[in-house]
């Protein structure tokens, strides 16, 4: 198909950064300022994205590639190609329609984005809580209660130290 297209389409070989100009008998013309064509054979150039307001420019537009935006401090990108900027919250919070709200008891968020997630339920794995959870941190699960029964240890004891020059008995 590509070969057929190139044989039939007089525009197929205009390089990226140009367009096939129908107003000039289909010769290749450079993309005008603030526009680009990222592939060859284009009949028009696309308007460059402008990073305004809460968006800031991460990469300038060129004749062959669109501008890329990210978000100003205090915001983070959402969507393909950073199509939206969403307000950051503190760790231990989540963004609601009314703004940043603390995580409810039993949930945590260790990032500036996203939602509060429930603490891990250690007992589901037959383990106990070693370190309690907070709004910012998940619980740390420790060994199961059975592992802590007398005579059992969750930690392997170190091998006895040998004094220099003594061979083991």
């Amino acid at each position: 198909f590509e070969r057929t297209r190139s044989l039939q389409d007089p525009c197929s070989n205009c390089p990226a950064g140009t367009f096939c100009d129908n107003n000039r008998n289909q010769i290749c013309s450079p993309c005008p300022p603030n526009s680009f064509s990222s592939a060859g054979g284009q009949r028009t150039c696309d308007i460059c994205r402008q990073c305004k307001g809460v968006f800031r420019t991460r990469k300038e537009c060129s004749s062959t590639s669109n501008a890329e935006c990210d978000c100003t401090p205090g915001f983070h990108c959402l969507g393909a190609g950073c199509s939206m900027c969403e307000q950051d919250c503190k760790q231990g919070q989540e963004l609601t329609k009314k703004g940043c709200k603390d995580c409810c008891f039993g949930t945590f968020n260790d990032q500036k984005r996203g939602i509060c997630r429930p603490w891990t339920n250690c007992s589901l794995d037959g383990k106990s809580v070693l370190v309690n959870g907070t709004k910012e941190r998940d619980v740390v699960c420790g060994p199961s209660p059975a592992d802590l029964s007398p005579g059992a240890s969750s930690v392997t004891p170190p091998a006895p130290a040998r004094e220099p020059g003594h061979s083991p008995q």
């Epitope: 190139s6 044989l7 389409d9 007089p10 525009c11 197929s12 070989n13 205009c14 390089p15 950064g17 140009t18 096939c20 000039r24 008998n25 289909q26 010769i27 290749c28 013309s29 450079p30 054979g41």
Partner: nanobody, 121 residues
Amino acid sequence: EVQLLESGGGEVQPGGSLRLSCAASGFTFSINAMGWYRQAPGKRREFVAAIESGRNTVYAESVKGRFTISRDNAKNTVYLQMSSLRAEDTAVYYCGLLKGNRVVSPSVAYWGQGTLVTVKP
């Protein structure tokens, strides 16, 4: 306005050489393919050679190994170096700005006015 101005034609003996030039203006030269065509008395205009912006070249079978097309993007000029000229090379030689930077099955968007090359003993 697109302008193509050929020069370098003249009279030469068989086996001789000539270099034709085509000075271009009114468009972005470096991104477009250019070609040379010729028209002998009483015949149709025919393709001679073409060069793409990326410097890929194509030649008519009748001139392969004898003619060389080249370009200087800094000077907006395309050249046709002709050697081992024959009587059948006698023609008006035209510079053409090709559509869509194409050298395969090219079609001409704009023509120059032509320069006469005569090969005779």
